[in-house]
Protein backbone atom coordinates (compact mmCIF):
# COMPACT_ATOMS: atom_id res chain seq x y z
CA UNK A 1 0.00 0.00 0.00
CA UNK A 2 1.13 3.52 -0.69
CA UNK A 3 1.55 5.99 2.13
CA UNK A 4 -0.37 8.63 0.28
CA UNK A 5 -3.93 9.49 1.16
CA UNK A 6 -5.42 12.19 -1.01
CA UNK A 7 -7.64 13.51 1.73
CA UNK A 8 -5.27 13.74 4.66
CA UNK A 9 -3.20 16.78 3.86
CA UNK A 10 -5.63 19.44 4.98
CA UNK A 11 -5.68 21.01 1.53
CA UNK A 12 -7.95 20.68 -1.45
CA UNK A 13 -5.81 19.60 -4.38
CA UNK A 14 -7.23 19.46 -7.87
CA UNK A 15 -6.03 16.95 -10.40
CA UNK A 16 -5.06 18.63 -13.67
CA UNK A 17 -6.23 16.94 -16.83
CA UNK A 18 -4.65 17.68 -20.16
CA UNK A 19 -1.36 19.47 -19.96
CA UNK A 20 -0.21 20.48 -16.51
CA UNK A 21 -0.19 24.25 -16.16
CA UNK A 22 3.24 25.79 -15.66
CA UNK A 23 4.42 29.28 -14.92
CA UNK A 24 5.70 31.27 -17.86
CA UNK A 25 9.41 30.60 -17.89
CA UNK A 26 10.27 33.66 -19.90
CA UNK A 27 7.65 36.20 -18.94
CA UNK A 28 8.48 39.14 -16.75
CA UNK A 29 6.58 39.47 -13.48
CA UNK A 30 3.72 41.87 -13.14
CA UNK A 31 4.15 44.78 -10.72
CA UNK A 32 2.75 42.77 -7.84
CA UNK A 33 5.39 40.09 -8.26
CA UNK A 34 3.04 37.41 -9.61
CA UNK A 35 3.11 35.63 -12.93
CA UNK A 36 0.09 33.93 -14.41
CA UNK A 37 0.11 30.26 -15.29
CA UNK A 38 -0.71 29.08 -18.77
CA UNK A 39 -4.17 27.84 -17.84
CA UNK A 40 -6.94 28.17 -15.29
CA UNK A 41 -5.88 31.79 -14.58
CA UNK A 42 -4.14 30.75 -11.36
CA UNK A 43 -0.98 32.52 -10.33
CA UNK A 44 2.17 31.80 -8.35
CA UNK A 45 4.72 34.34 -7.15
CA UNK A 46 7.88 34.83 -9.18
CA UNK A 47 10.36 31.97 -8.65
CA UNK A 48 7.64 29.60 -7.44
CA UNK A 49 6.55 26.56 -9.46
CA UNK A 50 2.89 25.74 -10.09
CA UNK A 51 1.56 22.21 -9.79
CA UNK A 52 -2.02 21.00 -9.24
CA UNK A 53 -3.39 24.25 -7.86
CA UNK A 54 -0.42 24.68 -5.51
CA UNK A 55 2.69 26.85 -5.59
CA UNK A 56 6.09 25.44 -4.56
CA UNK A 57 9.31 27.22 -3.68
CA UNK A 58 12.69 25.46 -3.56
CA UNK A 59 15.39 27.46 -1.86
CA UNK A 60 19.03 27.50 -2.87
CA UNK A 61 20.06 28.88 0.52
CA UNK A 62 20.20 26.68 3.61
CA UNK A 63 18.86 27.09 7.13
CA UNK A 64 17.75 25.08 10.15
CA UNK A 65 14.30 23.49 10.24
CA UNK A 66 12.86 26.18 12.53
CA UNK A 67 14.28 28.93 10.32
CA UNK A 68 12.93 27.12 7.28
CA UNK A 69 9.49 26.88 8.84
CA UNK A 70 9.58 30.58 9.66
CA UNK A 71 10.80 31.46 6.18
CA UNK A 72 7.87 29.61 4.59
CA UNK A 73 5.45 31.16 7.05
CA UNK A 74 6.74 34.60 6.10
CA UNK A 75 5.89 33.79 2.48
CA UNK A 76 2.34 32.76 3.40
CA UNK A 77 3.18 29.10 3.00
CA UNK A 78 4.23 26.01 4.93
CA UNK A 79 6.99 23.47 4.58
CA UNK A 80 5.87 20.93 1.97
CA UNK A 81 3.64 18.02 2.89
CA UNK A 82 4.51 15.23 0.45
CA UNK A 83 1.60 12.86 0.76
CA UNK A 84 0.42 12.06 -2.76
CA UNK A 85 2.30 10.21 -5.49
CA UNK A 86 1.68 13.08 -7.88
CA UNK A 87 3.30 15.56 -5.53
CA UNK A 88 6.21 13.21 -4.85
CA UNK A 89 6.95 12.78 -8.56
CA UNK A 90 6.69 16.53 -9.13
CA UNK A 91 9.15 17.25 -6.32
CA UNK A 92 11.54 14.57 -7.52
CA UNK A 93 11.47 16.25 -10.94
CA UNK A 94 12.37 19.67 -9.53
CA UNK A 95 14.67 19.00 -6.55
CA UNK A 96 18.38 19.29 -7.25
CA UNK A 97 20.87 16.74 -5.90
CA UNK A 98 20.62 18.32 -2.45
CA UNK A 99 18.70 17.80 0.79
CA UNK A 100 15.55 19.84 1.40
CA UNK A 101 13.63 20.19 4.64
CA UNK A 102 9.95 19.25 4.41
CA UNK A 103 7.06 19.54 6.84
CA UNK A 104 7.62 16.21 8.57
CA UNK A 105 8.69 15.96 12.22
CA UNK A 106 9.16 13.23 14.81
CA UNK A 107 6.94 13.29 17.89
CA UNK A 108 8.99 11.60 20.59
CA UNK A 109 6.14 11.16 23.03
CA UNK A 110 4.16 9.24 20.40
CA UNK A 111 7.20 7.64 18.75
CA UNK A 112 5.79 8.48 15.35
CA UNK A 113 6.36 10.89 12.46
CA UNK A 114 3.67 13.41 11.62
CA UNK A 115 3.21 16.01 8.94
CA UNK A 116 3.00 19.56 10.24
CA UNK A 117 -0.77 19.52 9.71
CA UNK A 118 -0.77 16.71 12.30
CA UNK A 119 -1.64 13.91 9.87
CA UNK A 120 0.30 10.69 10.43
CA UNK A 121 3.16 9.67 8.12
CA UNK A 122 2.71 6.00 7.29
CA UNK A 123 5.94 5.41 5.42
CA UNK A 124 9.40 4.75 6.77
CA UNK A 125 11.94 7.43 7.56
CA UNK A 126 15.50 6.33 6.91
CA UNK A 127 18.67 7.41 8.74
CA UNK A 128 16.81 7.55 12.06
CA UNK A 129 18.81 8.69 15.05
CA UNK A 130 17.87 9.73 18.58
CA UNK A 131 18.72 13.33 17.78
CA UNK A 132 17.19 13.46 14.28
CA UNK A 133 13.64 14.78 14.64
CA UNK A 134 13.22 16.51 11.28
CA UNK A 135 13.16 15.11 7.75
CA UNK A 136 14.55 15.89 4.31
CA UNK A 137 14.01 14.70 0.77
CA UNK A 138 15.91 15.35 -2.44
CA UNK A 139 19.27 13.59 -2.45
CA UNK A 140 17.70 10.13 -2.44
CA UNK A 141 14.28 8.68 -3.09
CA UNK A 142 13.73 8.35 0.65
CA UNK A 143 12.40 10.46 3.49
CA UNK A 144 15.54 10.90 5.56
CA UNK A 145 15.72 11.82 9.22
CA UNK A 146 17.96 14.83 9.87
CA UNK A 147 19.07 17.05 12.70
CA UNK A 148 16.70 19.99 12.97
CA UNK A 149 19.68 22.23 13.74
CA UNK A 150 21.72 21.43 10.64
CA UNK A 151 21.17 23.78 7.70
CA UNK A 152 19.55 22.38 4.56
CA UNK A 153 17.54 23.79 1.71
CA UNK A 154 13.75 23.97 2.05
CA UNK A 155 10.58 23.37 0.07
CA UNK A 156 7.63 25.65 0.78
CA UNK A 157 4.11 25.22 -0.58
CA UNK A 158 0.86 27.18 -0.62
CA UNK A 159 -2.37 27.48 -2.55
CA UNK A 160 -2.18 29.12 -5.95
CA UNK A 161 -4.28 32.27 -6.21
Amino acid sequence: PQIFNKSNDGFTTTRSYGTVSQIFGSSSPSPNGFITTRSYGTVCPKDWEFYQARCFFLSTSESSWNESRDFCKGKGSTLAIVNTPEKLKFLQDITDAEKYFIGLIYHREEKRWRWINNSVFNGNVTNQNQNFNCATIGLTKTFDAASCDISYRRICEKNAK
Epitope: P1, Q2, I3, V20, Q22, I23, F24, G25, R38, E49, L58, T60, P85, L88, K89, Q92, D93, I94, T95, D96, A97, N122, G123, N124, V125, T126, K141, T142, F143, D144
Partner: antibody, heavy 116, light 113 residues
Framework: QVQLVQSGAEVKKPGASVKVSCKAS????????LGWVRQAPGQGLEWMGD????????YYNENFKGRVTMTTDTSTSTAYMELRSLRSDDTAVYYC?????????WGQGTLVTVSS | DIVMTQSPDSLAVSLGERATINCKSS????????????LAWYQQKPGQPPKLLIY???TRESGVPDRFSGSGSGTDFTLTISSLQAEDVAVYYC?????????FGQGTKVEIK
Amino acid sequence: QVQLVQSGAEVKKPGASVKVSCKASGYGFNNYWLGWVRQAPGQGLEWMGDIYPGSGNTYYNENFKGRVTMTTDTSTSTAYMELRSLRSDDTAVYYCARGKESFAYWGQGTLVTVSS
Amino acid sequence: DIVMTQSPDSLAVSLGERATINCKSSQSLFNFSNRNNYLAWYQQKPGQPPKLLIYFASTRESGVPDRFSGSGSGTDFTLTISSLQAEDVAVYYCQQHFTTPYTFGQGTKVEIK
Protein backbone atom coordinates in the same frame (compact mmCIF):
# COMPACT_ATOMS: atom_id res chain seq x y z
CA GLN B 1 2.35 24.68 -22.82
CA VAL B 2 5.55 22.77 -22.19
CA GLN B 3 7.57 22.30 -25.38
CA LEU B 4 10.93 20.72 -26.11
CA VAL B 5 12.22 21.39 -29.63
CA GLN B 6 15.29 19.53 -30.81
CA SER B 7 17.85 20.25 -33.53
CA GLY B 8 17.72 18.60 -36.93
CA ALA B 9 19.03 15.29 -38.19
CA GLU B 10 22.79 14.72 -38.40
CA VAL B 11 25.01 12.42 -40.43
CA LYS B 12 28.43 11.71 -38.94
CA LYS B 13 31.44 9.56 -39.70
CA PRO B 14 32.74 6.98 -37.21
CA GLY B 15 35.06 8.59 -34.66
CA ALA B 16 33.40 12.01 -34.98
CA SER B 17 31.29 13.83 -32.38
CA VAL B 18 27.73 15.10 -32.46
CA LYS B 19 26.03 17.78 -30.36
CA VAL B 20 22.24 17.70 -30.19
CA SER B 21 20.29 20.66 -28.80
CA CYS B 22 16.95 20.81 -27.03
CA LYS B 23 15.23 24.17 -26.59
CA ALA B 24 12.68 24.30 -23.78
CA SER B 25 9.73 26.66 -23.36
CA GLY B 26 6.57 26.93 -21.30
CA TYR B 27 8.08 26.22 -17.89
CA GLY B 28 10.90 27.24 -15.56
CA PHE B 29 13.82 25.63 -17.38
CA ASN B 30 16.27 25.98 -14.49
CA ASN B 31 14.05 24.10 -12.08
CA TYR B 32 13.44 20.74 -13.75
CA TRP B 33 15.74 17.83 -14.47
CA LEU B 34 16.17 17.13 -18.17
CA GLY B 35 17.04 13.65 -19.36
CA TRP B 36 18.33 12.19 -22.61
CA VAL B 37 17.09 8.88 -24.02
CA ARG B 38 18.04 7.24 -27.30
CA GLN B 39 16.37 4.68 -29.51
CA ALA B 40 18.20 2.72 -32.20
CA PRO B 41 16.17 1.97 -35.37
CA GLY B 42 13.50 -0.60 -34.58
CA GLN B 43 14.90 -1.05 -31.08
CA GLY B 44 14.03 -0.16 -27.52
CA LEU B 45 14.83 2.84 -25.33
CA GLU B 46 18.11 3.56 -23.54
CA TRP B 47 18.56 6.20 -20.82
CA MET B 48 21.77 8.17 -21.32
CA GLY B 49 21.75 10.55 -18.37
CA ASP B 50 20.26 13.76 -17.04
CA ILE B 51 21.13 17.29 -15.99
CA TYR B 52 19.71 19.85 -13.57
CA PRO B 53 20.03 23.18 -15.41
CA GLY B 54 19.92 25.31 -12.25
CA SER B 55 23.18 23.85 -10.97
CA GLY B 56 24.67 21.87 -13.84
CA ASN B 57 24.59 18.67 -11.78
CA THR B 58 24.62 15.60 -14.02
CA TYR B 59 24.18 11.84 -13.82
CA TYR B 60 25.41 9.70 -16.70
CA ASN B 61 24.81 6.12 -17.73
CA GLU B 62 28.18 4.47 -17.27
CA ASN B 63 27.55 2.37 -20.38
CA PHE B 64 28.65 5.41 -22.36
CA LYS B 65 32.10 5.25 -20.76
CA GLY B 66 32.80 8.95 -20.63
CA ARG B 67 31.75 9.58 -24.24
CA VAL B 68 28.75 11.74 -23.29
CA THR B 69 28.58 15.30 -21.92
CA MET B 70 25.37 17.11 -21.05
CA THR B 71 25.30 20.88 -20.67
CA THR B 72 22.77 23.71 -20.60
CA ASP B 73 22.61 27.37 -21.56
CA THR B 74 20.15 28.87 -19.09
CA SER B 75 20.08 32.20 -20.95
CA THR B 76 18.41 30.50 -23.92
CA SER B 77 16.72 27.62 -22.03
CA THR B 78 18.60 25.14 -24.18
CA ALA B 79 20.11 21.79 -23.23
CA TYR B 80 22.86 20.04 -25.17
CA MET B 81 24.00 16.45 -25.39
CA GLU B 82 27.40 15.77 -26.96
CA LEU B 83 28.40 12.22 -27.85
CA ARG B 84 32.00 11.58 -28.88
CA SER B 85 33.89 8.77 -30.64
CA LEU B 86 30.81 7.81 -32.58
CA ARG B 87 30.34 4.24 -33.79
CA SER B 88 27.85 2.75 -36.21
CA ASP B 89 25.80 1.39 -33.32
CA ASP B 90 25.27 4.95 -32.08
CA THR B 91 22.89 5.43 -35.00
CA ALA B 92 19.64 6.27 -33.23
CA VAL B 93 16.96 8.83 -32.54
CA TYR B 94 18.06 10.92 -29.56
CA TYR B 95 15.33 12.40 -27.35
CA CYS B 96 15.43 15.00 -24.61
CA ALA B 97 12.74 14.59 -21.96
CA ARG B 98 11.70 16.59 -18.92
CA GLY B 99 11.84 14.88 -15.56
CA LYS B 100 14.18 13.10 -13.21
CA GLU B 101 13.17 9.47 -13.50
CA SER B 102 10.05 9.13 -15.60
CA PHE B 103 9.29 11.54 -18.38
CA ALA B 104 6.00 13.28 -19.13
CA TYR B 105 7.31 15.66 -21.83
CA TRP B 106 9.56 14.68 -24.74
CA GLY B 107 11.24 16.42 -27.63
CA GLN B 108 10.39 15.29 -31.15
CA GLY B 109 13.70 13.43 -31.46
CA THR B 110 16.88 13.94 -33.47
CA LEU B 111 18.07 11.22 -35.84
CA VAL B 112 21.83 10.78 -35.75
CA THR B 113 23.21 8.50 -38.44
CA VAL B 114 26.78 7.24 -38.13
CA SER B 115 28.09 5.93 -41.41
CA SER B 116 31.38 5.82 -43.25
CA ASP C 1 21.96 -2.73 -14.10
CA ILE C 2 18.35 -3.73 -13.50
CA VAL C 3 17.02 -5.86 -16.36
CA MET C 4 13.41 -5.34 -17.42
CA THR C 5 11.67 -8.16 -19.28
CA GLN C 6 8.27 -7.74 -20.91
CA SER C 7 5.84 -10.38 -22.08
CA PRO C 8 4.50 -11.03 -24.56
CA ASP C 9 6.57 -9.44 -27.33
CA SER C 10 3.39 -8.84 -29.31
CA LEU C 11 -0.30 -9.05 -28.61
CA ALA C 12 -3.37 -9.05 -30.88
CA VAL C 13 -6.64 -8.12 -29.19
CA SER C 14 -10.13 -7.45 -30.54
CA LEU C 15 -11.55 -3.96 -30.25
CA GLY C 16 -13.28 -3.51 -26.93
CA GLU C 17 -11.47 -6.45 -25.35
CA ARG C 18 -8.93 -6.39 -22.53
CA ALA C 19 -5.18 -6.25 -23.25
CA THR C 20 -2.67 -7.25 -20.57
CA ILE C 21 1.08 -6.66 -20.71
CA ASN C 22 3.48 -8.00 -18.10
CA CYS C 23 6.82 -6.61 -16.97
CA LYS C 24 9.33 -8.30 -14.69
CA SER C 25 12.36 -6.61 -13.11
CA SER C 26 15.55 -8.37 -12.04
CA GLN C 27 15.32 -6.76 -8.60
CA SER C 28 12.62 -5.21 -6.47
CA LEU C 29 11.48 -1.70 -7.40
CA PHE C 30 9.73 -1.14 -4.07
CA ASN C 31 10.85 1.91 -2.10
CA PHE C 32 10.64 1.07 1.60
CA SER C 33 10.58 4.73 2.65
CA ASN C 34 7.70 6.13 0.58
CA ARG C 35 6.11 2.73 -0.18
CA ASN C 36 5.99 3.27 -3.93
CA ASN C 37 7.09 0.96 -6.72
CA TYR C 38 9.31 2.84 -9.16
CA LEU C 39 7.87 1.46 -12.37
CA ALA C 40 6.56 3.51 -15.32
CA TRP C 41 4.69 2.58 -18.50
CA TYR C 42 4.93 4.37 -21.86
CA GLN C 43 3.05 4.17 -25.13
CA GLN C 44 4.90 4.82 -28.39
CA LYS C 45 3.34 5.19 -31.81
CA PRO C 46 5.40 5.11 -35.03
CA GLY C 47 7.37 8.30 -35.64
CA GLN C 48 6.46 9.74 -32.25
CA PRO C 49 8.26 10.01 -28.92
CA PRO C 50 7.03 7.83 -26.06
CA LYS C 51 4.07 9.04 -24.01
CA LEU C 52 4.04 8.54 -20.24
CA LEU C 53 0.95 6.61 -19.13
CA ILE C 54 1.68 5.40 -15.60
CA TYR C 55 4.34 6.04 -12.95
CA PHE C 56 4.84 4.58 -9.46
CA ALA C 57 3.35 1.37 -10.96
CA SER C 58 -0.26 2.56 -10.67
CA THR C 59 -0.49 6.37 -10.76
CA ARG C 60 -2.03 7.51 -14.04
CA GLU C 61 -0.42 10.53 -15.67
CA SER C 62 -2.69 13.55 -16.18
CA GLY C 63 -4.89 13.22 -19.26
CA VAL C 64 -4.41 9.48 -19.70
CA PRO C 65 -7.75 7.67 -20.24
CA ASP C 66 -8.88 5.55 -17.31
CA ARG C 67 -9.00 2.43 -19.46
CA PHE C 68 -5.24 2.30 -18.82
CA SER C 69 -4.30 0.96 -15.41
CA GLY C 70 -1.14 -0.33 -13.79
CA SER C 71 -0.69 -2.82 -10.99
CA GLY C 72 1.92 -4.95 -9.30
CA SER C 73 4.64 -4.64 -6.70
CA GLY C 74 8.22 -5.68 -6.11
CA THR C 75 9.36 -7.35 -9.32
CA ASP C 76 6.12 -8.17 -11.17
CA PHE C 77 3.98 -5.55 -12.85
CA THR C 78 1.06 -5.38 -15.27
CA LEU C 79 -0.36 -2.77 -17.64
CA THR C 80 -4.02 -3.35 -18.47
CA ILE C 81 -6.04 -1.71 -21.23
CA SER C 82 -9.58 -2.54 -20.13
CA SER C 83 -11.27 -1.96 -23.49
CA LEU C 84 -8.92 -1.69 -26.46
CA GLN C 85 -9.55 1.23 -28.82
CA ALA C 86 -8.14 1.64 -32.33
CA GLU C 87 -5.92 4.50 -31.14
CA ASP C 88 -4.26 2.20 -28.59
CA VAL C 89 -2.33 0.36 -31.32
CA ALA C 90 1.28 1.06 -30.35
CA VAL C 91 4.37 -0.33 -28.69
CA TYR C 92 4.29 -0.26 -24.89
CA TYR C 93 7.40 -0.06 -22.72
CA CYS C 94 7.91 -0.48 -19.01
CA GLN C 95 10.73 1.43 -17.32
CA GLN C 96 12.24 1.15 -13.87
CA HIS C 97 12.88 4.54 -12.27
CA PHE C 98 14.24 3.05 -9.06
CA THR C 99 17.95 3.41 -9.64
CA THR C 100 20.37 4.60 -12.31
CA PRO C 101 20.85 3.68 -15.01
CA TYR C 102 17.11 3.75 -15.57
CA THR C 103 16.27 0.85 -17.86
CA PHE C 104 13.40 -0.08 -20.17
CA GLY C 105 11.79 -3.31 -21.21
CA GLN C 106 12.17 -4.43 -24.81
CA GLY C 107 8.63 -3.38 -25.68
CA THR C 108 5.32 -5.07 -26.43
CA LYS C 109 3.54 -4.42 -29.71
CA VAL C 110 -0.25 -4.23 -29.39
CA GLU C 111 -2.32 -4.78 -32.53
CA ILE C 112 -5.98 -5.23 -33.43
CA LYS C 113 -7.12 -8.80 -33.97
